[in-house]
Interface confidence: low
């Protein structure tokens, strides 16, 4: 999937399996990514687990779990708030669009999370105070945690290079991967561009991600995934000057 | 957890009987309770690095000290016998201090926190 980190780095990650996105004293988010096509290096998010840890007199520990074709509007215990404590309503799940869009607000830690199902796959966006991000027991033992540290270099796809190399061609390969199987319905480059331009008129990294995803999969739902990801940034990002990211800010080796 | 911030919180609340906005003639006693609270947080500081409740308390104490013109030096108070649930925004009036604290623990007395964003989408 495409990742925008807390430090506004933009990466395309081919990580498969379960990986932690966020892990601190208050919140643990883990995603499971699966290949979009058999044998493809590109992966998308098929499962998401969010753990809100027990917090003082506000909320009990709560677990939220979403999977492909299952975007519940409740925690796994069936509740929609933080439990039985006095401040339980400082953690709330709201269903925005049934089966497609859920918002979780954890006011006690100033955090808003948006989870969507777009097509077969999930998207995730969060707005969180730096103080919460930095609330960890031991920085030295912090494992790989994607929102903070990004993907390991060997798990990144240079999709901008791919984007440049595929102008005028259909999707035939993936950077950093063996030749990807042809998508069931591969778009010509021009069609991909046109479809992405419709939803994403600014040629930023979200637009480029959209083009990459269409060329890689032929699945038009990925246009909406990029569109909603940008919409979520508009809602959640505190710096309105950083809504759009462009090539010059892309992650370089050495991080 | 070795961080004893909740103990400091409850001692402060028992010392002030949960009064949210002490009247001016209560201020010396309130300041003494605040100084005790500050002392308690300093004692547990080393084990509370990165603890959200701890940092909230430290900011809250500073704000309340300045609001009530409390001097940093002066007498401290002993906690009373009965304790109340710890709460965060002690200067706010509310029927339910715990909810107030939970709802507002990141909209503290001063500036809005620095927010950050992370997102994951597509392939």
């Amino acid at each position: 999937p495409h990742l925008r980190t807390f430090t506004d780095r933009f990466q395309t990650c081919k990580v498969q399996g379960a990986w932690p996105l966020i892990d601190n004293n208050y919140l643990n988010v883990q995603v499971t990514n699966t290949p979009v096509l058999p044998g493809s290096a590109a992966t998308a998010t098929s499962k998401l687990t969010i753990i809100f840890k027990n917090f003082q007199e506000c909320v009990d520990q709560k677990v939220y779990q979403a999977e492909m074709d299952e975007l519940p509007a409740a925690f796994v215990d069936g509740s929609k708030n933080g439990g039985d404590k006095h401040g339980a309503n400082s953690l709330k799940i709201t269903e925005k669009v049934s089966g497609q869009h859920v918002e979780i607000r954890a006011k006690y830690i100033g955090t808003t999370i948006v989870v969507r199902q777009v097509g077969r796959y999930l998207t995730f966006a969060v707005r969180v105070p730096e103080e919460v991000v930095n609330a960890v027991e031991d920085w030295d033992s912090q494992g790989l945690y994607l929102c903070l540290r990004g993907c390991p270099l060997n798990q990144q796809i240079d999709f901008q290079a791919f984007h440049t190399n595929t102008e005028g061609t259909g999707a035939r390969r993936l950077a950093a991967a063996s030749p990807a199987p042809t998508a069931p319905e591969t778009f010509p480059y021009e069609t991909a561009v046109a479809k992405c331009k419709e939803k994403l008129p600014v040629e930023d990294l979200y637009y480029q991600a959209c083009v990459f995803d269409l060329l890689t999969t032929g699945d038009v739902n990925f246009t909406l995934a990029a569109y909603y990801a940008l919409e979520d940034v508009k809602m959640l990002h505190s710096n309105k000057d950083k809504l759009h990211l462009y090539e010059r800010t892309r992650d370089l080796p050495g991080r | 957890s070795p961080c004893k911030i909740l103990k400091c919180n409850s001692e402060f609340w028992s010392a002030t009987s949960g009064s949210h906005a002490p009247a001016s003639d209560d201020t010396p006693e309130f300041c003494a309770a605040l100084r005790s609270y500050a002392l308690c947080t300093r004692r547990t500081a080393r084990t509370c690095r990165g603890d959200l409740a701890y940092h909230s308390a430290v900011h809250g104490i500073e704000d309340l000290m300045s609001q009530h013109n409390c001097s940093k030096d002066g007498p401290t108070s002993q906690p009373r016998l009965h304790t109340l649930p710890p709460a965060g925004d002690s200067q706010e009036r509310s029927d339910s201090p715990e909810i107030c604290h939970c709802e507002k623990s990141f909209h503290k007395h001063s500036a809005t926190p620095n927010y950050t964003h992370c997102g994951l989408f597509g392939d």
Partner: antibody
């Protein structure tokens, strides 16, 4: 102190049912799930299922589906596990354990165990 | 047959370190953050020793530690003591069922 106190030992005949209780104290009963785990003599631990006292949601081990029923009574903070159509291989110590918000969570507090003997 | 495989027994002298492995599949161990470990003395209820692979509940000595590599989770007891002699079980969650390992008897020589 957080505690789970279970009912006493039972002797049952094959084909009968048994209902074991587990009374919780020292914490908010609806804030945690309850899992049931059994242990046959000289054997390892065997997970039976999970119930959320908050919602009544259950998650049973596949091999026990249809034979096990887990319930809770929030007014008395008590969880119950009923196993029907008992057979001799159901002879075991049955434990209740407190877990987090989902069936997959760790079990941080355990009851003392209830020995159920199935014998003709 | 348990879906999580543990050695039947391990032993060590006081002060030594012993490691117990717990091998499963990618879904039960490899991809899971929900691995926990339990200690059980004869005739007693199990006791939680580690959770979420590496985390130690309060009251559990720091000589108990956890790790995971691939599809194998491990519990290490460093500085073995007489009271550590017990059965140890790993637990994880795969799909719909919670799984326990078959148990490992730790003997202090």
């Amino acid at each position: 102190e957080v505690q789970l106190v279970q009912s006493g030992a039972e002797v049952k005949k094959p084909g009968a049912s048994v209902k074991v209780s587990c009374k919780a104290s020292g914490y908010t009963f609806t804030s945690h799930g309850i899992s049931w785990v059994r242990q046959a003599p000289g054997q390892g631990l065997d997970w039976m299922g999970w119930i959320s006292p908050y919602s009544g949601n259950t998650n049973y081990a596949q091999k026990l589906q249809g034979r096990v029923t887990m319930t809770t009574d929030t007014s008395t903070s008590t969880a119950y596990m009923e196993l029907s159509s008992l057979r001799s291989e159901d002879t075991a110590v049955y434990y209740c354990a407190r877990v987090g918000s989902g069936p997959y969570y760790y079990m941080d507090v355990w009851g003392q165990g209830t020995l159920v003997t199935v014998s003709s | 047959q348990s879906a999580l495989t543990q050695p039947r027994s391990v032993s060590g002298s006081p002060g030594q370190s012993v490691t117990i492995s717990c091998t499963g599949t990618s879904s039960s161990v490899g991809d899971s953050i929900y691995v926990s470990w339990y200690q059980q003395h004869p005739g007693k209820a199990p006791k939680l020793m580690l959770y979420d692979v590496t985390k130690r509940p309060s009251g559990v000595p720091d000589r108990f530690s956890g790790s995971k590599s691939g599809n194998t989770a491990s519990l290490t007891i460093s500085g073995l003591q007489a009271e550590d002699e017990a059965d140890y079980y790993c637990k994880s969650y795969a799909g719909t069922d919670t799984l326990f390992g078959g148990g490992t008897k730790v003997t202090v020589l």
